[in-house]
């Protein structure tokens, strides 16, 4: 029973984690304009892995995609790669783990096969979680470096009275979503690996021993006994994370100039 619970919980936790990784990857708020010195701003900048956006005080939001591949910083490309690898591994892991679940019967699949699949999916979840955590951490490190660099050159003089105030960026919501999601996927993977140990059949065959009782002969032959673990009835694995990332393709979100009541 405990093994099934551990496996089921590991699956659910990983599912939530991977949903979170997908959401974080799609989110636009990987870095947001630092408002420390100016909490109320007319133009609020924020950036994601795929596009950068501006929310105006007027209420309009406009996003612009990174339409170049070669012109992007290598670090950003690396973060994208890590997040995509994390998603792909996690998705494969989920697929494998569905068939590995003890509560799901598929033909005459041996417990040993289920144990192997559980271990495989567990490792995949662990690597997926690590990829997400690594990706988010690399981006966070990049932000910290840039933050202090732009603080040092907060005002780059352009001669006379003209000055360019550099926009400083700080951690966006996607980073925290990514860290938590990566952590959950990692935990789910560890739980799957633990469940695998319990699923692996222990072949403890005892030699047959004959007992001769007076009067009649009874042969007691214990052997090949497998401990049967009951399986949980809860097969509804709800996807709880609703990654509020906007994935629409439109670049601008404006009301029409004459939107009547």
């Amino acid at each position: 029973m405990a093994v099934t619970a551990c496996q089921g919980l590991g699956f659910v936790v990983s599912l939530i984690g991977i949903a979170g990784i997908i959401a974080a990857t799609c989110m636009d708020q990987w870095s947001t304009q630092d408002l420390y010195n100016n909490p109320v701003t007319a133009v609020f900048n924020y950036q994601g892995l795929w596009r950068s956006c501006v929310r105006e005080s007027s209420g309009f939001t406009e996003c612009r995609g990174y339409f170049t591949l070669l012109g992007l910083p290598a670090m950003l490309q690396a973060v994208r790669a890590l997040m995509i690898v994390g998603i792909v591994l996690g998705a494969i892991g989920l697929l494998v783990s569905i068939f590995a679940l003890k509560c799901i019967r598929i033909g005459s699949m041996e417990d040993s096969a289920k144990a192997n699949m559980t271990l495989t999916s567990g490792i995949m979840f662990i690597v997926s979680g690590l990829c997400a955590i690594a990706g988010v951490s690399v981006f966070a490190n990049m932000l910290v470096t840039n933050f202090w660099m732009s603080t040092a050159n907060m005002y780059t003089g352009m001669g006379g009275m003209v000055q360019t105030v550099q926009t400083r960026y700080t951690f966006g919501a996607a980073l925290f979503v990514g860290w938590v999601a990566g952590g959950l996927t990692l935990i789910g993977g560890v739980m799957m690996c633990i469940a695998c140990r319990g699923l692996a059949p222990e072949e403890t065959n005892y030699k047959a021993v004959s007992y001769h009782a007076s009067g009649h002969s009874v042969a007691y032959k214990p052997g090949g006994f497998k401990a049967s673990t009951g399986f949980g009835s809860n097969t509804k694995n709800k996807k709880i994370y609703d990654g509020g990332a906007r994935t629409e393709d439109e670049v601008q979100s404006y009301p029409s100039k004459h939107d009547y009541v």
Partner: antibody, heavy 118, light 113 residues
Framework: QVQLVQSGAEVKKPGASVKVSCKAS????????VNWVRQAPGQGLEWIGM????????RLNQQFKDKATLTVDKSTSTAYMELSSLRSEDTAVYYC???????????WGQGTLVTVSS | DIVMTQSPDSLAVSLGERATINCLSS????????????LTWYQQKPGQPPKLLIY???TRDSGVPDRFTGSGSGVDFTLTISSLQAEDVAVYYC?????????FGQGTKLEIK
């Protein structure tokens, strides 16, 4: 079509208060910020502040923080600006304007002349 | 606060000729998120409220004739009227829409020579 109609001209004594109204029509009032701008006779434009009709959130130019109070009445789609402790320097035409994309003001009221004179 | 400085203060141009008004900002008006410049141009005729001509430094508002062109980026902006018409006589203002408080240039008075 979009229209912003302001209240009529006012003549006030120094130290008094005045409330200028701006009635909006032809668009969804609660979707757009309403700005207030003043123009002293023969002078340029000066931004006072703006108010969002949906939550009455305001952004005020620090220069006017003790002078202007911005409010809205959603039921009548009207924005108000109250000017207190009037002085002769407050004599100006006061405009309301809707905020469009790019933080630009696309539709303007006809203006309200406030004259402060003893 | 961002200071907007227009030049010249007044300008006299012949009908059909090109008119150019400059606007210099004390700070960059370029938003990194969408690479747009938050600079707006208005036209004000005597006894009338200002009229929006151009926003985002170069985007013409609906109904604005295409003889009006906005250009520039960062701190330096220009409004160009390619062929001056009699109805273009007015005062022109530039406005910072990048940061609070929104500020206007002192205005440029355009007249016919």
């Amino acid at each position: 079509q979009v229209q912003l109609v302001q209240s009529g001209a006012e003549v006030k004594k120094p130290g008094a208060s005045v409330k200028v109204s701006c009635k909006a029509s032809g668009y969804s009032f609660t979707n757009y910020w309403v700005n207030w701008v003043r123009q002293a006779p023969g002078q340029g434009l000066e931004w006072i502040g703006m108010v969002h009709p949906s939550g009455s959130e305001t952004r005020l130019n620090q220069q006017f923080k003790d002078k202007a109070t911005l409010t809205v009445d959603k039921s009548t789609s009207t924005a108000y600006m109250e000017l207190s402790s009037l002085r002769s320097e407050d004599t100006a035409v006061y405009y309301c304007a809707r905020v469009w994309s790019g933080n630009a003001f696309d539709y303007w009221g006809q203006g309200t002349l406030v004259t402060v004179s003893s | 606060d961002i200071v907007m400085t227009q030049s010249p203060d007044s300008l006299a141009v012949s009908l059909g000729e090109r008119a150019t008004i400059n606007c210099l900002s004390s700070q960059s008006l370029l938003a990194s998120g969408n690479q747009r410049n938050y600079l707006t141009w208005y036209q004000q005729k005597p006894g009338q409220p200002p009229k929006l001509l151009i926003y985002w430094a170069s985007t013409r508002d609906s109904g604005v004739p295409d003889r009006f062109t906005g250009s520039g980026s960062g701190v330096d902006f220009t409004l160009t009227i390619s062929s001056l018409q009699a109805e273009d006589v007015a005062v022109y203002y530039c406005q910072n829409g990048f940061s609070f408080p929104f500020t206007f240039g002192q205005g440029t008075k355009l007249e016919i020579k």
